[in-house]
């Protein structure tokens, strides 16, 4: 039987027949059966964290994690340094900075130690697994008498986000919400003033930079209305 | 009962092209992800192109640029769009599915695939 032999250049399934070829059920060993999925998500471009359901396995196994990137100079198979763990079993990876390369296919390979044959290789498109920190420094600024502008920051390149901002007073039930570009500021003309309002931002790094999913946190509520503080009606700092 | 068949193959002359189908019976393939392997002659069997069902898609070296991977979850089939095919592309083609959990599993290894149709014949000359 062949061993399997990690090569980073697209063909790193040496083990293909003996996986392929027919067996009867009652022979299955436990190199057929199937290893965890293993979930990615890069965070604010800091660090990424690769994590698989250890608890999956039919016993607890101390799995291991290798990667590399296809066709880049970051082609080199590489040990995971920096294990996660769950009750004491490998339950993921993380991989700092450093080791991140947004825009190169990063392939992951899981493998059971004890059972060499029985490994999983995965692709995955690190830009559309961003998760930007959640906004910071919200402030609400009274363009006119019926006007707000709320503006906030991101830890990360503003023209790579998108948001989502959403805003209710104490009379609403349920949030209203509105789909903020990289231009991170919102207005909404028309305020009542017998109302206190509540907004939250949270922000996707999507469309121009890559097609994540997931947004980020929710920042921070900000409040703005009746009972908060008269002293400086055009400007309203973030209050946690 | 789990069928993938796969159809579209045949004999085509180097520089041709050829589109290969897979179409699944007795499972919906929307939450699956799909990989396209190849076996010539006296040698392993090699991935070709994967598709999370999330819609990422990955190629192996020697075909990209020249294959396009498609799924179309509304007649639960996937595509394999060959161009500018070569004789070293001369081989058994299958289709192959596995269930995953999330939208960007898109497996390369062929025994991570729980779901295997039997194949279709290219043959390329030159």
């Known amino acids: 039987l062949n061993t399997t032999i990690l090569t980073p250049n697209g063909n790193e399934d040496t083990t293909a027949d003996f996986f392929l070829t027919t067996m009867p059920t009652d022979s299955l060993s436990v190199s057929t059966l199937p290893l965890p999925e293993v979930q990615c998500f890069v965070f604010n471009v800091e660090y990424m964290n690769c994590t698989w359901n250890s608890s999956s396995e039919p016993q607890p196994t101390n799995l291991t994690l290798h990667y590399w990137y296809k066709n880049s100079d970051n082609d080199k198979v590489q040990k995971c340094s920096h294990y996660l763990f769950s009750e004491e079993i490998t339950s993921g990876c993380q991989l700092q900075k450093k080791e991140i390369h947004l825009y190169q296919t990063f392939v992951v390979q899981l493998q059971d130690p004890r059972e060499p044959r029985r490994q999983a290789t995965q692709m995955l498109k690190l830009q559309n697994l961003v998760i930007p920190w959640a906004p910071e420094n919200l402030t609400l600024h009274k363009l006119s008498e019926s006007q707000l502008e709320l503006n906030w920051n991101n830890r990360f390149l503003n023209h790579c986000l998108e948001h989502l901002v959403q805003y209710r007073t104490d009379w609403d039930h349920s949030w209203t919400e509105q789909s903020v570009d990289y231009r991170h500021k919102f207005s909404l003309p028309s305020v009542d003033g017998q109302k206190r309002y509540t907004f939250r931002v949270r922000s996707r790094f999507n469309p121009l930079c890559g097609s994540a999913q997931h947004w980020s946190e929710w920042s921070h509520p900000i409040h703005w209305g009746s009972n908060t503080s008269k002293e400086n009606p055009f400007l309203f700092a973030l209050e946690a | 009962q789990v069928q993938l068949v796969e159809s579209g193959g045949g004999l085509v002359q180097a520089g041709g092209s050829l589109r290969l189908s897979c179409a699944a019976s007795?499972?919906?393939?929307?939450?699956?992800?799909m990989g396209w392997f190849r076996q010539a002659p006296g040698k392993e069997r090699e991935f070709v192109a994967v598709?999370?069902?999330?819609?990422?898609?990955f190629y192996t070296d020697s075909v990209e640029g020249r294959f396009t991977f498609s799924r179309d979850n509304a007649k639960n089939a996937v595509y394999l769009e060959m161009n500018d095919l070569q004789p070293e592309d001369t081989a058994v083609y299958y289709c192959?599915?596995?269930?995953?959990?999330?939208?960007?599993?898109?497996?390369?290894?062929?025994?991570?695939?729980?779901?295997w149709g039997r194949g279709t014949q290219v043959t390329v000359s030159s």
């Open positions: 192959a599915a596995a269930p995953t959990s999330f939208a960007t599993t898109a497996y390369s290894s062929s025994n991570s695939y729980s779901y």
């Open positions: 007795g499972r919906s393939l929307s939450r699956d992800a």
């Open positions: 598709m999370s069902w999330g819609g990422d898609t």
